[in-house]
């Protein structure tokens, strides 16, 4: 998915991926840090949410996530032995009815409103990373991830493999 | 179709080197992870070593840290596993696999390549 | 490190029979909210094949009569009605942290 080839060979893989269930098959309730341990958080400002990084005061509390995991299917020219490869696939809601979005056109990550079927722009591939990080990448724009840029999440182009351990799109999933 | 074939398996006296290699292709090598696994013979699997897709990070067993040597050539489609003084309880089938997308679990092995450390 | 132990060593059965495999880990393989214990099918002469990955969830191409269940350090991979392809050894492998380690396995032979 990374490197330039590698983004438009791998375009077609996630585009193309089938969520194998419409449940999730587990889901996770924790608090999202950055790399470098900044809380992102999420304020409700004229009835709708904004989503910020900071720092937290000592004793403030984190807010948490709703992490909703699937698994998805992706083409057999991408996987293995011929036949499809599975990936885990994650939609993030830190209050009810409310989902982490990839806005494309504007390069942001913002909080939507749905009703189910999530469309895809809510999906996120999931990626376990070193340094007990994750990093997220979009369904619908393979090789952009979820990423910090000044005190906001956006959506980050990795054009490499080597860029995928950049800082600013790693983040750490805590239940505390 | 996805493929994973490793060669430079051999017998080699205590003490020596050897270098396997995994070809890889019918997937977007640098995307992925990937790793060595080894089987004794008769004897259950053991993971050797680990380097991510951008070879930023390498981990490995301890019993083969200062040793061996896990590298990638993306150019090349191809893994390797440099090895070096060897031991008899290194003689094993050395299987190369790849991570699923995203990095969570070994989805793709290759055949296999028996060493064999023996004097 | 992570020590897996699988049990029984070796499970005789026929074909049609169920079969229960055990995998207790020395303590939880638990994170991010997932199970990361996966289950691998081997037989002689070929690479191992992924089953099961994340405790419960089926790999590419595998057959609706392999199911893994458990959570935190205890996991069963069950087999609801064995065919004679599925005479192998099974080993569960846990992705929580490195080293990532491997179960001795478990042996099901035809009785």
């Known amino acids: 998915a990374f490197g330039i080839s590698g983004v438009q060979k791998y375009t077609r893989a996630l585009h193309d991926s089938s969520i194998t269930g419409i449940s999730p098959i587990t889901e996770y309730l924790a608090s999202l840090s950055t790399y470098n341990d900044q809380s992102i958080t999420f304020a409700l400002e004229d009835e709708s949410y904004e989503i910020y990084v900071e720092d937290l005061k000592k004793d403030e509390k984190k807010d948490k996530v709703l992490l909703s995991y699937y698994e998805s299917q992706h083409p057999s020219n991408e996987s293995g032995d011929g036949v499809d490869g599975k990936m885990l696939m994650v939609t993030l809601s830190p209050t009810k009815d409310f989902w982490l979005h990839a806005n494309n056109k504007e390069h942001s990550v913002e909080l939507h409103k749905c009703e189910k079927p999530l469309p895809d722009q809510a999906f996120f591939v999931l990626h376990n990373m070193h340094s007990n990080c994750v990093s997220f990448e979009c369904k619908t724009d393979p090789g952009v991830f979820i990423g910090v840029k000044d005190n906001h999440l956006a959506l980050i182009k990795v054009d490499s493999s080597e860029n995928l351990c950049t800082e600013n799109i790693l983040f750490k999933l805590s239940e505390t | 179709e996805v493929q994973l074939v490793e060669s430079g398996g051999g017998l080699v006296q205590p003490g020596g080197s050897l270098r396997l290699s995994c070809a890889a292709s019918?997937?977007?090598?640098?995307?992925?992870?990937l790793s060595w696994v080894r089987q004794a013979p008769g004897k259950g699997l053991e993971w050797v070593a680990t380097?991510?897709?951008?070879?930023?990070?390498?981990d490995y067993v301890d019993s083969v840290k200062g040793r061996f040597t896990i590298s990638r050539d993306n150019s090349k489609n191809t893994l390797y596993l440099q090895m070096n003084s060897l031991r008899a309880e290194d003689t094993a089938v050395y299987y190369c696999?790849?991570?699923?997308?995203?990095?969570?679990?070994?989805?793709?092995w290759g055949q296999g390549t028996l060493v064999t450390v023996s004097s | 490190e992570i020590v897996l132990t699988q049990s029984p060593a070796t499970l005789s059965l026929s074909p049609g029979e169920r079969a229960t495999l055990s995998c207790r880990a020395s303590?939880?393989?638990?994170?991010?909210?997932?199970?990361?214990l996966n289950w691998f099918q081997q037989k002689p002469g070929q690479p191992p094949r992924l089953l099961i990955f994340?405790?419960?969830n089926r790999g590419s191409g595998v057959p609706a009569r392999f199911s893994g269940s458990g959570s935190g350090t205890d996991f069963t991979l069950t087999i609801s009605s064995l065919e004679p392809e599925d005479f192998a050894v099974y080993f569960c492998q846990q992705s929580k942290e490195v080293p990532f380690t491997f179960g001795q396995g478990t042996k099901v032979e035809i009785k």
């Open positions: 019918g997937f977007t090598f640098s995307s992925f992870s």
């Open positions: 696999t790849r991570a699923n997308y995203g990095n969570w679990f070994f989805e793709v």
């Open positions: 994340a405790a419960s």
């Open positions: 380097i991510s897709g951008g070879k930023t990070f390498t």
């Open positions: 303590e939880s393989v638990a994170k991010y909210g997932l199970s990361l």
